[in-house]
């Protein structure tokens, strides 16, 4: 088992909004849960976009999930990752 490296980034979207992207890379096996939580509960699936789980060329995999949020509400969002029985949560950077 190779645990993922998880990285959260933000980018400007429309006025007053930002897109936050959570990337998991260099993990094996390929089964992974990567999702955004808002206010501690599940963010609805129709407000998230997922990338495919793809090989990254080193025998490991990578994927991502993104969502658009209001600027100023970043604290209320965390990216949740679960892989091979381990889990972690990742805040949006300031």
């Amino acid at each position: 088992t190779v645990p993922p490296m998880v990285n959260v980034t933000r980018s400007e979207a429309s006025e007053g909004n930002i897109t936050v992207t959570c990337r998991a890379s260099s993990f094996y096996p390929r089964n992974i849960i990567l999702t955004w939580r808002q206010d501690g509960v599940s963010l609805s699936h129709d407000t998230q976009q997922w990338g495919d789980v793809l090989p990254d060329g080193n025998g490991t995999y990578q994927t991502w999930v993104a969502t658009r949020i209001c600027r100023g509400a970043e604290q209320r969002f965390t990216c949740y990752m679960e892989h091979s029985g381990n889990h972690s949560t990742h805040p949006v950077p300031s």
């Epitope: 939580r37 501690g40 604290q75």
Partner: antibody, heavy 119, light 107 residues
Framework: DVQLQESGPGLVKPSQSLSLTCTVT?????????WNWIRQFPRNKLEWMGY???????NYNPSLKSRISITRDTSKNQFFLQLISVTTEDTATYYC????????????WGQGTLVTVSA | DIQMTQSPASLSASVGETVTITCRAS??????LAWYQQKQGKSPQLLVY???MLADGVPSRFSASGSGTQYSLKINSLQPEDFGSYYC?????????FGAGTKVEIK
């Protein structure tokens, strides 16, 4: 460590309002987290009532929405529960708690305060 | 709302026994589940979050598992301090709801 302490009257008359205070020490309620009220009925059923978060946003259980208000006093690091038009069915032990945004579970609770609704 | 159904409502067990408590959600909660222990006259204490993760300070005789709508809490080699009531709680969506509880009593 975050510590929470509930206070308020132990007896309320039917049709009146129930008002409780949660005093938080060890952490500023404006820094982060969702600050919650949960109650436990005499037969031990637990009910999440709602929260006020670090920025003052509230979220209530729809079953209580017409009767509940959660507010705060940031200068005293306190948050409050008001429940109007109470009946004997609102007799319960009321707890305050908080959760972090990595997941809505409750790591620490206050000791609880029993409120009896009776004429 | 998601309803949480716990079973059994109560059980009697002896020190050293293994007990299992189950919790069924009315919909898929995708591991968004916590377990609490409550002793008589005390506040609930967090045992497990994210369905399987033990909270800080929880003894390793406790374990939890499950997925989808079915979850369980197992206590290996029950100790005197383990007697009390246990509750599950989902956090998939609002409103957050709890199971009705399982009371673990001394046989």
């Amino acid at each position: 460590d975050v510590q929470l302490q509930e206070s308020g009257p132990g007896l309320v008359k039917p049709s009146q309002s129930l008002s409780l205070t949660c005093t938080v020490t060890g952490y500023s309620i404006t820094s982060d987290y969702a600050w919650n009220w949960i109650r436990q009925f005499p037969r031990n059923k637990l009910e999440w009532m709602g929260y006020i978060n670090y920025s003052g946003t509230t979220n209530y259980n729809p079953s209580l929405k017409s009767r509940i208000s959660i507010t705060r006093d940031t200068s005293k690091n306190q948050f409050f529960l008001q429940l109007i038009s109470v009946t004997t069915e609102d007799t319960a032990t009321y707890y305050c708690s908080y959760y972090r945004y990595d997941g809505a579970w409750f790591p620490y609770w206050g000791q609880g305060t029993l409120v009896t609704v009776s004429a | 709302d998601i309803q949480m159904t716990q079973s059994p409502a109560s059980l009697s067990a002896s020190v050293g026994e293994t007990v299992t408590i189950t919790c069924r959600a009315s919909g898929n909660i995708h591991n968004y589940l916590a377990w609490y222990q409550q002793k008589q006259g005390k506040s609930p204490q967090l045992l497990v979050y994210n369905a399987i993760m033990l909270a800080d300070g929880v003894p390793s005789r406790f374990s939890a598992s499950g997925s989808g709508t079915q979850y369980s809490l197992k206590i290996n080699s029950l100790q005197p301090e383990d007697f009390g009531s246990y509750y599950c709680q989902h956090f998939w969506s609002f409103p957050l709801t709890f199971g009705a509880g399982t009371k673990v009593e001394i046989k």
